[in-house]
């Protein structure tokens, strides 16, 4: 069904990092255009990118309502010039997407170390504390106001001179770690939500070592 | 667990009007879309109306359009079904059901039963 | 308004045959169409929705199928509380519609 020379949209899919989250469809119009329209399971349908040429749709500002909730996205496909016409059934042609739930399946970004520095033998690493665009009275949230306590951090470092690596975590931004005296060492971490069955971990984060290690212990 | 239980039902003559509840537990229900679904004695089922979480989006099927209308009241967890100018035809079973994006229906009342009859 | 037709309208099995009912559409409705079971005097319960998506709680000897006019609904084998009666329903657009049913007995 549907009208002439409009054809559904197909391969609805998801694209979100840290609540950014973008729907992203095909095939590229020809002599169509598209509108979006995003709900949770209240049925109550928002219309978003009304009548674009575009082949994708940010939806943050949508979903960061409440990103526990699961939303259902729907893609509608109307003739180019002629956006009152419908189907054969008096009705535009659509496509839902999958579901989606965004604290189940944004991917994490990669993380950030902010920061090493040494007390005595110890480092502490310090992981940049990522500001989402999930506000709350009025203010943005950060990943771990968002998270909370699922979110766990990786530490992985190792002597520059052996490839032995070691493995530290967290759920907070900070570790403090054993280090030998005199030696250097790299660090790269890693985001992990052990509550979610997949899609649980970040990209590794750009890994950072320390230089000239002697004068940062003082000698 | 899911529970959702009609009233309201019973025996009413041709022209008459009756007041279905649906009271909601065991999830947050201004979540959800709700709906009606009917099943006349010894028929199939038969989508009746539909309602989206805020209450702002309804739909009816053309038998029933300007004679009942569905509503809710989320601070009561509560669906109703008015139906005015009743017939014949609409002694059925009425079942409320919750009803994710307004689709599919996951779960169901136990229905109750209207009769319409002189 | 879409036309949703069963086949069979009833069928007779034995416990553990593999069982087929389809339903079709008068025109396309993608995936959107779901499946109940309903027992006699009893409220129908989800067993299907988007077609293949089984319903949280049903067991996996059921199974849905199809996309577009034709879908079919598999019990992978049959087990005496499966003998009720099963409806198909689009959800593509309203009024949204149902299948008359196919009554499954036992054979």
């Known amino acids: 069904s549907g009208t002439t020379n409009t054809v559904a949209a197909y391969n609805l899919t998801w694209k979100s990092t840290n609540f950014k989250t973008i729907l992203e469809w095909e095939p590229k119009p020809v002599n169509q255009v598209y509108t979006v329209q995003i709900s949770t399971k209240s049925g109550d349908w928002k219309s978003k990118c009304f009548y674009t040429t575009d082949t994708e749709c940010d939806l943050t500002d949508e979903i960061v309502k409440d990103v526990k909730q699961t939303y259902l996205a729907r893609v509608f496909s109307y003739p180019a010039g002629n956006v009152e016409s419908t189907g054969s059934a008096g009705e535009p042609l659509y496509e839902n997407s999958p579901e989606f739930t965004p604290y189940l399946e944004t991917n994490l970004g990669q993380p950030t170390i902010q920061s090493f520095e040494q007390v005595g033998t110890k480092v502490n690493v310090t992981v940049e504390d990522e500001r989402t665009l999930v506000r709350r009275n009025n203010t943005f949230l950060s990943l771990r106001d968002v998270f909370g306590k699922d979110l766990i951090y990786t530490l992985y470092y190792w002597k520059s001179s052996s490839s032995g690596k070691k493995t530290a975590k967290t759920n907070t931004n900070e570790f403090l770690i054993d280090v030998d005296k005199g030696e250097n060492y790299c660090f790269s971490v890693q985001a992990v939500i052990f509550s979610r069955k997949t899609n649980h971990k970040s990209p590794e984060s750009i890994t950072k070592c320390t230089e000239q290690w002697k004068s940062v212990l003082g000698e | 667990e899911v529970q959702l239980l009609e009233s309201g039902g019973g025996l009413v003559q041709p022209g008459g009007s009756l007041r279905l509840s649906c009271a909601a537990s065991?999830?947050?229900?201004?979540?959800?879309?709700m709906s009606w679904v009917r099943q006349a004695p010894g028929k199939g089922l038969e989508w009746v109306s539909s309602?989206?979480?805020?209450?702002?989006?309804?739909y009816y099927t053309d038998s029933v359009k300007g004679r009942f209308t569905i509503s809710r009241d989320n601070s009561k967890n509560t669906l109703y079904l008015q139906m005015n100018s009743l017939r014949a035809e609409d002694t059925a079973v009425y079942y409320c059901?919750?009803?994710?994006?307004?689709?599919?229906?996951?779960?169901w009342g136990q229905g109750t039963l209207v009769t319409v009859s002189s | 308004d879409i036309q949703m037709t069963q086949s069979p309208p009833s069928l007779s099995a034995s416990a553990g045959d593999r069982v087929t009912i389809t339903c079709r559409a008068s025109q396309g409705i993608s995936s959107r169409l779901a499946w109940y079971q309903q027992k006699p005097e009893k409220a129908p319960k989800s067993l299907i929705y988007a077609a293949s998506s089984l319903q949280s709680g049903v067991p996996s000897r059921f199974s849905g199928s199809g996309s577009g006019t034709d879908f079919t609904l598999t019990i992978s084998s049959l087990q005496p509380e499966d003998f009720a009666t099963y409806y198909c329903q689009q959800y593509n657009s309203y009024p949204y519609t149902f299948g008359q049913g196919t009554k499954l007995e036992i054979k």
């Open positions: 059901a919750r009803s994710p994006w307004g689709y599919y229906l996951d779960s």
């Open positions: 309602i989206s979480g805020s209450g702002d989006y309804t």
């Open positions: 065991g999830f947050t229900f201004s979540n959800y879309a």
